[in-house]
């Protein structure tokens, strides 16, 4: 696996331990928490990043209306089980034998059950809607400039193929970025939209996962873009399975059909 040879660090994942013990004395980096060797030339999977995070010491309407089956990560952090490739296992359980099924981005898509709960397959999240509100700026953002800058960001910083950035919508002060990636579209070596979205989410929280870089400086024609609030909606290839009780009154979305929770990042 490639890593910075001079000081043996992982440019794309600061939550690693690196040493020159790879083949031929090459730098090899392993994710904290799992010890899994990671490829430092690309993004680390969200599952391994969440595991590492849990192991670390604690210190005119153009906007998209989320689909009724859209999920938002309501449950927050947990210590996930990852498969040998670093993907989320379809079934996740906690220490008290409470289990649930997750999608490919690790977000719960069923009611919680016990150890008898079956999750037959890992359901792919094929559509991610990133909903941002930027803080007021001295200069207005031009939609096409903003679109180009966000596409450049996902291409250059997160190494996501441009074809997976489906659209960028803007109605000041709300920006929406749509990522789409079906199972059939994702080729070997392609960054997963779920991983790109997670890196972006951490960046806009001021918690960059990249090694030795300052925070993300995002500019549109020189004007800095600062994010006040972020909401991420996840849509799966197969709709989630929640009980009617949850759909009618269990969520905080006021009777909405999606798992709805506002992440106030700042």
């Amino acid at each position: 696996h490639t890593a910075a040879q001079d000081n043996c660090t992982c440019p794309t994942n600061k939550m690693t331990v690196c040493s020159p013990d790879g083949p031929g004395g090459r730098c090899q980096c392993r994710a904290l928490g799992s010890g899994v060797a990671v490829d430092c030339s690309t993004l680390t999977s969200k599952c391994l990043l969440l595991k590492a995070r849990m192991s670390a010491p604690k210190n005119a309407r153009t906007l998209v209306r989320p689909n009724e089956h859209a999920l938002v990560d309501n449950d927050g952090l947990y210590d996930p089980d990852c498969d040998p490739e670093g993907r989320f296992k379809a079934r996740q359980c906690n220490q008290t034998s409470v289990c649930w099924c997750v999608n490919s981005v690790g977000v719960r898509r069923t009611d919680k059950g016990d150890l008898s709960l079956r999750c037959d397959e890992l359901v792919r999240t094929h559509h991610i809607l990133i909903d941002l509100r930027h803080r007021p700026t001295a200069g207005a953002f031009n939609h096409s400039d903003l679109d180009a800058e966000l596409r450049r960001l996902f291409r250059e910083r997160y190494r996501l193929h441009p074809k997976f950035v489906a659209a960028v919508h803007y109605e000041q002060p709300t920006i929406q970025i749509e990522l789409r990636q079906n199972t059939s579209q994702k080729a070997a070596g392609d960054v997963d939209i779920g991983d790109a979205a997670y890196y972006f989410e951490r960046d806009v929280k001021g918690e960059s996962l990249f090694q030795g870089r300052g925070g993300l400086d995002l500019r549109v024609r020189g004007e800095p873009l600062q994010v006040e609030r972020t909401l991420i909606y996840y849509l799966d290839e197969i709709p989630p399975k929640f009980s009617m009780k949850r759909l009618t009154g269990g969520g905080s979305g006021g009777g909405s059909h999606h798992h709805h929770h506002h992440h106030h990042h700042h």
């Epitope: 001295a138 400086d217 500019r219 600062q226």
Partner: antibody, heavy 122, light 106 residues
Amino acid sequence: QVQLVQSGAEVKKPGASVKVSCKASGYTFTSSDINWVRQRPGQGLEWMGWIYPRDGSKKYNEKFKGRVTMTVDTSTSTVYMELSSLRSEDTAVYYCATRFATVVSNYGLDPWGQGTLVTVSS
Amino acid sequence: EIVLTQSPATLSLSPGERATLSCSASSSVNYIYWYQRKPGQAPRLLIYDTSNLASGIPARFSGSGSGTDFTLTISSLEPEDFAVYYCQQWNSYPLTFGQGTKVEIK
């Protein structure tokens, strides 16, 4: 450390132009904008504009539009501010200052160059 | 343009005393920035985004406020704090500064 070094003092005649340079070091030059601020004798601080070295974007104070031109030379990490049609009231200390920002915060103007005194006198 | 009015124009205090400097905006702004300027020196950033201490600035400096009224507080004046202080807004162009408050030794 981040440092901005400006060119030396200038004495100009009314109607002439002056070009002040600001050389940056200690950071990735293209990653933040360079602002120009002046202070006339006994007066407060007055913002003139900024230039963003990565793509050459600029924003000028309307008060100076048509008289001020900001340019960048990325090969030497230097920004230039040219003020034309000088008059006596342009006598001031001219400062460059960089503004770092992230998606989380705008870190203000920090640091500043040492200042360049421009005297306009016949 | 947004006009920032600082008060008082001059503040006469002794070392060890608390200094409270005000900055009032002609229309609502989201954040204010504070700078210190000493004779013959370039201004120095003290506070960014209203209340965040800039790198290397002592904790005796603090900022607060919202909307149109903002405050810079120096909890206990040190000899090196006697200077002119400016507030600045980044809400709309042109960027503007207050006229300054001079903190002098009583």
